[in-house]
């Protein structure tokens, strides 16, 4: 059967007026997941975006991460988007540095 | 095959309010946003707003943020507009749009043409 | 909020011809970011190119895009006799979301 990802969206200052956002997939199973941001609902190009490999993580399942940088004060246009066997989520960028959002999806 | 099928045309007072629904079929509902066009008679194209279905977002044109509301019903996969306080220069088609992986608005409803007249 | 020109306002052209359209933008954008938009009368927009020069599913390919920065055009290499409605194209890139003022493709 499948396990569904805990999807986790952190961020990080980079550089002055801009922010590092982070998605990151962890405990799912299988390994294919699309995991991507989006502006407006627009994914964001390739070239814009790093991903991370997705790997095992020991329990049988798998985990990955996607990042981009985004100008601080635009927080709200941006969401991180999952695909995983036939299910998906959006995910919003946490409003300041201490908060952290942790979903598992069914 | 992925349409949006819209609600039809409303006669409307100066300072009543309209709602204009928009229900998509042939894709996952709370997958892709949610926009909103208007065209007035012989005009250009002007963003309202959007909404995302599966967390609830709003982001609204400033031009329009007092006087639209946008939300969707994910029990029955339909997303509504409604402008409230109409004016006569708010006779326009009004279009739901899906987001696209690559560009803001990929697949269009057939619109909704809203006329305020006294 | 970034304002986008397009030019000429009509063009009068025949089925054959080659038809370029423009679209200045008033501050820089990523060819990310830029659309293109075709109507004809009584219908909704169809998406007709996505980000500057990406043709969308089912467009023929007669239609391409180009530009960068704040310049942008539309080319149409022969107009065919269904080619001929209002072309519009639009940006992404920040808030509000804008459309230019069109371009009408009419018959010469």
């Known amino acids: 059967g499948s396990v569904p990802p805990m999807v986790n969206v952190t961020r990080s200052e980079a550089s002055e007026g801009n922010i590092t956002v982070t998605c990151r997939a962890s405990s799912f199973y299988p390994r294919n997941i699309t995991l991507t941001w989006r502006q407006d609902g627009v994914s964001l190009s390739h070239d814009t975006q790093q991903w991370g490999d997705v790997l095992p993580d020991g329990n049988g399942t798998y985990q990955t991460w996607v990042a981009t940088r985004i100008c601080q004060g635009e927080e709200q246009r941006f969401t991180c988007y999952m695909e995983h066997s036939g299910n998906h989520s959006t995910h919003p960028v946490p409003s300041g540095n201490s908060h952290h959002h942790h979903h598992h999806h069914h | 095959e992925i349409q949006l099928v819209q609600s039809g045309a409303e006669v409307k007072k100066p300072g009543s309010s309209v709602k204009v629904s928009c229900k998509p079929s042939g894709y996952a509902f709370t997958s892709n946003n949610i926009y909103w066009v208007r065209q007035a008679p012989g005009q250009g194209l002007e963003w309202i707003g959007y909404i995302d279905p599966y967390i609830g977002r709003i982001i609204y044109n400033q031009q329009f943020k007092d006087r639209a509301t946008l939300t969707v019903d994910k029990s029955t996969s339909t997303a509504y507009m409604e402008l409230s306080s109409l004016r006569s220069e708010d006779t326009a088609v009004y279009y739901c749009s899906r987001s696209g992986e690559r560009s803001n608005f990929d697949y269009w409803g057939q619109g909704t043409l809203v006329t305020v007249s006294s | 909020e970034i304002v986008l020109t397009q030019s000429p306002a009509t063009l009068s052209l025949s089925p054959g011809e080659r038809a370029t359209l423009s679209c200045s933008a008033s501050?820089?954008?990523?060819?990310?970011?830029l659309h293109w938009y075709q109507q004809k009368p009584g219908q909704a927009p169809r998406l007709l190119i996505y980000r500057t020069s990406n043709l969308a599913s089912g467009i023929p390919a007669r239609f391409s895009g180009s530009g960068s920065g704040t310049d942008f055009t539309l080319t149409i290499s022969s107009l065919e006799p269904e080619d001929f409605a209002v072309y519009y194209c639009q940006q992404g890139g920040s808030l509000p979301l804008t459309f230019g003022q069109g371009t009408k493709v009419e018959i010469k």
């Open positions: 501050s820089s954008i990523s060819s990310n970011y």
